[in-house]
């Protein structure tokens, strides 16, 4: 953790990406027993609170404003040296969000990936952002940064994520920035959950009263498994968002969730997945697809009494 070569190591908790009005702890890790440190900002928009101040252990900076965005270094206390201070630490870039309208974030071909697959996360905006940043929730290192490509009044950047593995699953957000203020980022895009599938055994999916029903008849899809999944996710081919329900232990020692689809209006192909509360972005193999057919006069949509999950939230715990 030490910077080596008499250099301290400067880090930020919980993240280097901080919302306007938020707080961030800057920690200067130097030699054991030498806890005092000095902070300074490299650019010209100095933060006056640092001038001549000595901090211990960590410094909580905030509420942050756009002026706090920039590159920081620290020096550790070194009483017996000529200057009394160590060499400067690594540079640490603090980015302040909420300074422009949020961009949009999409996954191509989609947010569900098998191990080893690659996904393109496209961040785009009709704000002419110069740079786009992609950040994964809960990660303290710097976000990935790409130059925006501008075409037809839209600026966009394509981030390649993969080959997919456990460590890459999670909630992603992207941000944009303009040239003269590269670390004053936009508001975050809506969160996008990237899910890794295929790591556990597949559940089974069945329909009550059956896979072929009369128009207007109530249909329930049941997802079940001998594995003690906490949550089941039901997806319909051609629909962007899945529904999810908590699994319920049954007397036959299976774990099941019943998804009421309401009165049947038209059919579709359904799949379900299981996941555990501790790893909400890691899903089982897909169940075998279940084709639900509706006889009679189908209308254009199937109303859903089950609340479909929002665009995101998969990777947060279901309480």
């Amino acid at each position: 953790l030490m910077g080596g070569q008499d250099k301290p190591f400067l880090s930020a908790r919980p993240s280097t990406v901080v919302p306007r009005g938020g707080h961030v702890a800057l920690q200067c890790h130097y030699r054991r027993g030498f806890n005092n440190f000095m902070l300074y900002k490299e650019d010209r928009s100095h933060v006056p609170i640092f001038h001549g101040r000595i901090f211990q252990e960590s410094f909580i900076m905030g509420p942050v404003t756009p002026a706090h965005a920039g590159t920081y270094r620290c020096r550790g206390s070194r009483p017996h040296s000529l200057t009394g201070w160590s060499a400067p630490s690594n540079p640490l870039v603090i980015m302040v969000t909420g300074n422009h309208r949020k961009p949009s974030l999409l996954a191509h071909p989609g947010p569900l990936l098998k191990s080893g697959e690659t996904v393109i996360l496209q961040c785009w905006s009709d704000v002419m952002f110069e740079h786009f940043f992609l950040h994964r929730e809960g990660i303290s290192e710097d976000p990935s940064r790409l130059v925006g490509q501008i075409h037809d009044g839209v600026s966009k950047a394509n981030f390649s994520i993969g080959p997919m593995m456990l460590a890459l699953a999670g909630t992603y957000r992207c941000y944009g920035s303009v040239p003269h203020s590269p670390y004053q980022l936009s508001a975050p895009s809506d969160p996008l959950d990237i899910v890794i599938t295929g790591l556990y055994e597949k559940p089974s999916l069945s329909a009550q009263p059956g896979p072929t029903v009369q128009a207007g008849e109530n249909v329930t899809l049941s997802c079940s498994s001998w594995s003690s999944y906490d949550i089941y996710h039901l997806s319909r081919e051609g629909e962007a968002h899945e529904r999810r329900l908590r699994a319920v232990p049954k007397v036959n020692r299976t774990f099941q969730a019943d998804f009421p689809l309401g009165p049947a209006t038209h059919g579709g192909t359904y799949r379900c997945f299981g996941s555990f509360r501790a790893l909400p972005c890691v899903w089982s193999n897909s169940s075998d697809p279940l084709l639900v057919s509706v006889t009679g006069n189908p209308s254009s949509s199937w109303p859903s009494p089950t609340e479909p999950s929002s665009k995101s939230g998969i990777c947060r715990h279901l309480h």
Partner: antibody, heavy 115, light 107 residues
């Protein structure tokens, strides 16, 4: 199409206040910061600063701190430049221009300060 | 502040001639440079951004080049309507700064 339409010419006495408007159309107003640029008679262009139309935060160049104020009326897609305690050297054409590289400009507002 | 030095300050050129105006920044500004055309009584017109990107609707005879500190605007074949004053602008760092301008007149 994108347009920035500025208010008309102003003739003022020293010590008075002037407020220039810049009405934007053809794009989402809060997408682009608004810059203000001064051109004194026979002189070049001078960047005065910008206002973040998303947050409302103004940034002023050193020569324009104090008597100058940028403001917004977001609902009307309009940015304003106010100059207080006018001086003779404020006589100039003032332009609004939107976006990080000043992509589109208003037609300019001539402010004449004279006794 | 970054100083932008533009040259020449004025020039005469003939119709059909190739014209080049240069702009030098006092420090590296990446490619964050725009070029503008000013004509009396008209709104300034943005020609180029990010050093070499042509703004929609600007004739293809205009082109920009350069990166770092040295930049140029070229008009491949001068037309009558191209007379005016040309300015460069760095937008890499606040405060933005303009070059001193180049007055282009037809011989």
């Amino acid at each position: 199409q994108i347009q920035l339409v500025q208010s008309g010419p102003e003739l003022k006495n020293p010590g008075e206040t002037v407020k220039i408007s810049c009405k934007a159309s053809g794009y989402i107003f809060t997408n682009y910061g608004m810059n203000w640029v001064k051109q004194a008679p026979g002189k070049g262009l001078k960047w005065m600063g910008w206002i973040n139309t998303y947050t409302g935060e103004p940034t002023y160049a050193d020569d324009f701190k104090g008597r100058f104020a940028f403001s917004l009326e977001t609902s009307a897609s309009t940015a304003y430049l106010q100059i207080n305690n006018l001086k003779n050297e404020d006589t100039a054409t003032y332009f609004c221009a939107h976006g990080p590289w000043l992509a589109y400009w208003g037609q300019g507002t001539l402010v004449t300060v004279s006794t | 502040d970054i100083k932008m030095t533009q040259s020449p300050s004025s020039m005469y050129a003939s119709l059909g001639e190739r014209v080049t105006i240069t702009c030098k920044a006092s420090q590296d500004i990446n490619s964050y440079l725009s070029w503008f055309q000013l004509k009396p009584g008209k709104s300034p017109k943005t020609l180029i951004y990010r050093a070499n990107r042509l703004v929609d609707g600007v004739p293809s005879r205009f082109s920009g080049s350069g990166s770092g500190q040295d930049f140029s605007l070229t008009i491949s074949s001068l037309e009558c309507e191209d007379m005016g004053i040309y300015y460069c602008l760095q937008y890499d760092e606040l405060p933005y700064t303009f070059g001193g301008g180049t007055t282009l007149e037809i011989k």
